[in-house]
Interface confidence: medium
């Protein structure tokens, strides 16, 4: 395989409810038709997957139906959105991009972004 | 664990057909392809192609064009490579491993082409 | 004759370093493929052993470690034990053949 560039952002913030949204961009070297993309959370030097999906260029990526993730894909990029998030899921999460057909495999790494999860604040009971 | 359990010995005579089996267990079996690798007796490893498990898509060496057929089955988790025209050559160990980066290997199927 | 050129064999006693190179050309390494390194122990299946140049999967010692540079990649293995004693294949896309190729095998002895 060819080393490929894979650029995400740095730092991304969950909304209150849980859901974090970034872009996963790869610089394509080959003519790739089908694609892996695999994200990874790194939290302590201990690397764990979170979800990964498998698709064919100008289809839908398809997560499995218990993955806390969905996206889409359009031409080299990928819109991952991870749901279900809190505060103790904050880290960097890593994305990894696999050009699997044709020959030859390409594989890239990002630098990772890290997401922010803030647990929103219990509302206080209200005495009327 | 990820495991690759392979077909047992096979002995064939010239002319003759193979198919070795390669059964996936402990990952997701669309996920990643089939890489089927042979290596003759006292020699080196032969890249033979690829097969996608996601969607069958398949890759073949110029050598085994016309001569090979890779193949999955989703439903047993299983992948099958069959190589026709058997020659005295192609007497080897077939390997099959997981994905185009072969990170996980079969324990290998011995085939013996003899008359 | 492989595309990818490898020593026939290597040695070094316990504790030593030793280094395999995979000499290619300008279709394989030099056109910048990433090279892969297998290790096969006797009577075994090979096992991944580096990847995309330098990179180990989990599980394999840090003793072993993987460079390139213009045509041809090395593998090093450092603090050389019995345990090591195999043969080593490199591997990498060859454009003009249009298939992945490994190369020659080397085999490495431990004194």
């Known amino acids: 395989c060819k080393a490929m560039h894979v650029a995400q952002p740095a730092v991304v913030l969950a909304s209150s409810r849980g859901i974090a949204s970034f872009v996963c961009e790869y610089a394509s070297p080959g003519k790739a038709t089908e694609v892996r993309v695999t994200v990874l959370r790194q939290a302590d030097s201990q690397v764990t997957e979170v979800c990964a999906a498998t698709y064919m260029m100008g289809n839908e990526l398809t997560f499995l139906d218990d993955s806390i993730c969905t996206g889409t894909s359009s031409g080299n990029q990928v819109n991952l959105t991870i749901q279900g998030l809190r505060a103790m899921d904050t880290g960097l999460y890593i994305c990894k991009v696999e050009l699997m057909y044709p020959p030859p495999y390409y594989l890239g790494i990002g630098n990772g972004t890290q997401i922010y999860v803030i647990d929103p604040e219990p509302c206080p009971d209200s005495d009327f | 664990q990820v495991q690759l359990q392979q077909s047992g010995t096979e002995v064939k005579k010239p002319g003759a057909s193979v198919k070795v089996s390669c059964k996936a267990s402990g990952y997701i079996f669309t996920s990643y392809g089939f890489t089927w690798v042979r290596q003759a007796p006292g020699q080196g490893l032969e890249w033979m192609g690829w097969?996608?498990?996601?969607?069958?898509?398949?890759d073949y060496a110029q050598k085994f064009e016309g001569r090979v057929t890779m193949t999955t089955d989703t439903s047993t988790t299983t992948a099958y490579m069959e190589l026709r025209g058997l020659k005295s050559d192609d007497t080897a160990m077939y390997y099959c491993a997981r994905g185009p980066q072969m990170d996980v290997w079969g324990q290998g199927t011995t085939v013996t082409v003899s008359s | 004759q492989s595309v990818l050129t490898q020593p026939p064999s290597v040695s070094g006693a316990p504790g030593q370093r030793v280094t395999i190179s995979c000499t290619g050309s300008s279709s394989n390494i030099g056109a910048g493929y990433d090279v892969h390194w297998y290790q096969q122990l006797p009577g075994t299946a090979p096992k991944l052993l580096i990847y995309?140049?330098?990179s180990r999967p989990s599980g394999v010692p840090d003793r072993f470690s993987g460079s390139k540079s213009g045509t041809s990649a090395s593998l090093a293995i450092s603090g050389l034990q019995s345990e090591d004693e195999a043969d080593y294949y490199c591997?990498?896309?060859?454009?003009?053949?249009?298939?992945?190729?490994f190369g020659s095998g080397t085999k490495v002895t431990v004194l």
């Open positions: 995309g140049n330098s």
């Open positions: 591997l990498s896309w060859d454009e003009s053949l249009n298939a992945y190729v």
């Open positions: 097969i996608s498990s996601y969607n069958g898509n398949t």
